[in-house]
């Protein structure tokens, strides 16, 4: 066959999907590769031809189309299964192509089992909630292009494994679950299952979703640097080792860079001579509130090192704010013998 | 509200020492590090250093180490900087300054003395 | 240290005018600049802080701008009480280091 654009197998879309649920894919030609639309192209007189890999196959394969009840089908740039089996898993391509023009991308599809409970190996979306906020939502997602809007779904909320119903401050609302006033222990794995007819036969569709309860904008304050701080003071001698750690809190707060970093007398560590080495660590909250903690190393610093200014920075989406080590060399006590018995007029 | 009182002018000998003062008012002496300014006639302006006045720690320029000592009298609420071998190039105007409150030393002074001048001449 | 050039001594405007002083760092001091104003026999008084902040009670017609080491100060429109001397401080590590000064003249 003639050259096609191959845009080989794109694992950015690893999709996921439940055993016996239908499902709907799109060709991701048109959703990240090409600059046009399905209808541009089926209009420019250009063909969508969609084949298979099976699981731990290398044979491509055309999909079958004349399954009974037309299990697998395509509309569109959509390749539909009602429902899927899990022997549906393999890699899928769809290719656009006329005598002139070839593009073509494979995406690999996995069909999910699920126990009782709704646990299963899907990887699950995150939703965040900020703490007691006010009434927030969650949507349950992935569900339009399933059923026309005539038609009225039955839609059931779980937590876990519990269907929720007369939950404190949890209300499902339809294709909504509404939080009234968000808690740590509304932390976990929410299902909603919709349930619509088609044609005579009824489908589920089962979605689940983890649901973070995070600190919110209305606490959140500039970063907050512990230490240093001016109630400690590194007092060395030349040869010794100085470590001052720099601690800083940062509230929560979406989509922020937290940063922190030295400076030695104005530089980063990586532009200045001296031998010094930066360990960092990280810690969060149940609020995802994060502590961050670089220690600065000099093995052994020297007297020069210890007239130097060392100021830890750091900076979120709130603020910027810098603090100050108190550094400083040790004076070494006086020896006895010689010092002190002349000072009290021993001869 | 806050003050930072200090002596309108000192006039010195060449050779000599002097110990300029800045009596602070309106706030916790002990919460606020005192930095200390200097100012030749007509030019720009220098950090000369900072103490903090709970633990008498200093930082200073290194280009006024050896001429300017820090100190503080917790007492009198006041601190002082002493210039030590005075010479014409020390004649300037010194400011104390500070920041709020619970601050550590990296940041700017939004509060000032009125200045001292020191004028060194023989 | 880290030095802070301000280019332009002297600035001659008019009541009304809008003027822009600049003031360049020797090396990255992120956000840490802070502007002041000193009028003849006056202390400074500090206008802006962390490179765009406004310190308590300044007209809102004194702004700043910058990160890195490029950092501007804008008067909106000039008043006749803002005859001055400019001057911006790296607050991002010590020695902190001032401008050398632009002194604003009015017309």
């Known amino acids: 066959s003639e050259r096609c654009d191959d845009w080989g197998l794109d694992t950015m879309r690893q999709i996921q999907v439940f055993e016996d649920e239908p499902a709907r894919i799109k060709c991701p030609l048109f959703e990240h590769f090409l600059k046009f639309n399905y209808s541009t192209a089926h209009s420019a007189g250009l063909t969508l031809i969609w084949y298979w890999t099976r699981q731990d196959r290398d044979l491509e394969e055309p999909i079958n189309f004349r399954l009974p009840e037309n299990r697998i089908s395509k509309e569109k740039d959509v390749l539909w299964f009602r429902p899927t089996l899990l022997n549906d898993t393999g890699n899928y391509t769809c290719m656009l192509r006329n005598t002139t023009y070839c593009s073509k991308v494979a995406f690999p599809l996995e069909v999910v089992q699920k126990d009782s409970c709704f646990n299963s190996p899907m990887k699950l979306p995150v939703h965040k909630l900020y703490i007691e906020y006010g009434i927030q939502r969650i949507t349950c997602p992935n569900v339009d292009g399933y059923f026309p809007s005539s038609v009225k779904p039955t839609i059931t909320w779980y937590m876990g494994c519990y269907k929720i119903q007369n939950f404190n401050n949890v209300i499902p609302e339809g294709m909504n679950l509404s939080f009234l006033i968000a808690l740590i222990s509304n932390n976990g794995n929410y299902t909603c299952v919709v349930t619509y007819p088609e044609n005579g036969r009824t489908f589920h569709l089962t979605r689940t979703l983890t649901v973070k309860v995070v600190g919110s904008p209305k606490n959140a304050v500039p970063p907050v640097i512990h230490s240093p701080n001016d109630h400690v003071v590194y007092e060395k001698e030349p040869g010794e080792e100085l470590l001052i750690p720099c601690t800083v809190y940062f509230s929560f707060l979406m989509d922020s860079r937290n940063e922190v970093w030295w400076t030695i007398d104005g530089k980063k560590p990586d532009d200045i001579t001296i031998d010094v080495t930066i360990n960092e660590s990280i810690s969060h909250s149940r609020t995802e509130d994060e502590t961050r903690t670089q220690i600065l190393s000099i093995k052994k610093v020297t007297s020069e090192d210890l007239k130097r200014s060392y100021v830890c920075h750091a900076r979120s989406a709130k603020g910027e704010v810098a603090k100050a080590a108190k550094v400083k060399q040790k004076v070494p006590a006086p020896r006895y013998t010689v010092e002190l018995a002349c000072g009290f007029g021993a001869t | 509200q806050v003050q930072l009182q200090q002596p309108g002018a000192e006039l010195m000998m060449p050779g000599a020492s002097v110990k300029v003062s800045c009596e602070a008012s309106?706030?916790?002496?002990?919460?606020?590090?005192m930095h200390w300014v200097k100012q030749r006639p007509g030019q720009g302006l220098e950090w000369i250093g900072a103490?903090?006045?709970?633990?008498?720690?200093?930082t200073y320029n290194q280009k006024f180490t050896g001429k300017a000592t820090l100190s503080v009298d917790e007492s009198s609420n006041t601190a002082y900087m002493q210039l030590s071998s005075l010479t014409s190039e020390d004649s300037a105007v010194y400011y104390c300054?500070?920041?709020?409150?619970?601050?550590?030393?990296?940041?700017?002074?939004?509060?000032w003395g009125q200045g001292t001048l020191v004028t060194v001449s023989a | 240290d880290i030095v802070m050039t301000q280019s332009h001594k002297f600035m001659s405007t008019s009541v009304g005018d809008r003027v822009t002083i600049t003031c360049k760092a020797s090396?990255?001091?992120?956000?840490?600049v802070a502007w002041y104003q000193q009028k003849p026999g006056q202390s400074p008084k500090l206008l802006i802080y962390?490179?765009?902040y406004r310190y308590t009670g300044v007209p809102d017609r004194f702004t700043g701008s910058g990160s890195g080491t490029d950092f501007t100060f804008t008067i909106s429109s000039v008043q006749a009480e803002d005859l001055a001397v400019y001057y911006c401080?790296?607050?991002?590590?010590?020695?902190?280091?001032f401008g050398s000064g632009t002194n604003l003249e009015i017309k």
């Open positions: 090396l990255d001091v992120s956000t840490a």
């Open positions: 962390s490179a765009s």
């Open positions: 103490i903090d006045p709970s633990d008498s720690y200093t």
């Open positions: 309106g706030y916790t002496f002990t919460d606020s590090w």
């Open positions: 300054a500070r920041y709020y409150s619970g601050s550590n030393y990296i940041s700017p002074f939004p509060y």
């Open positions: 401080q790296q607050h991002y590590s010590p020695p902190f280091t």
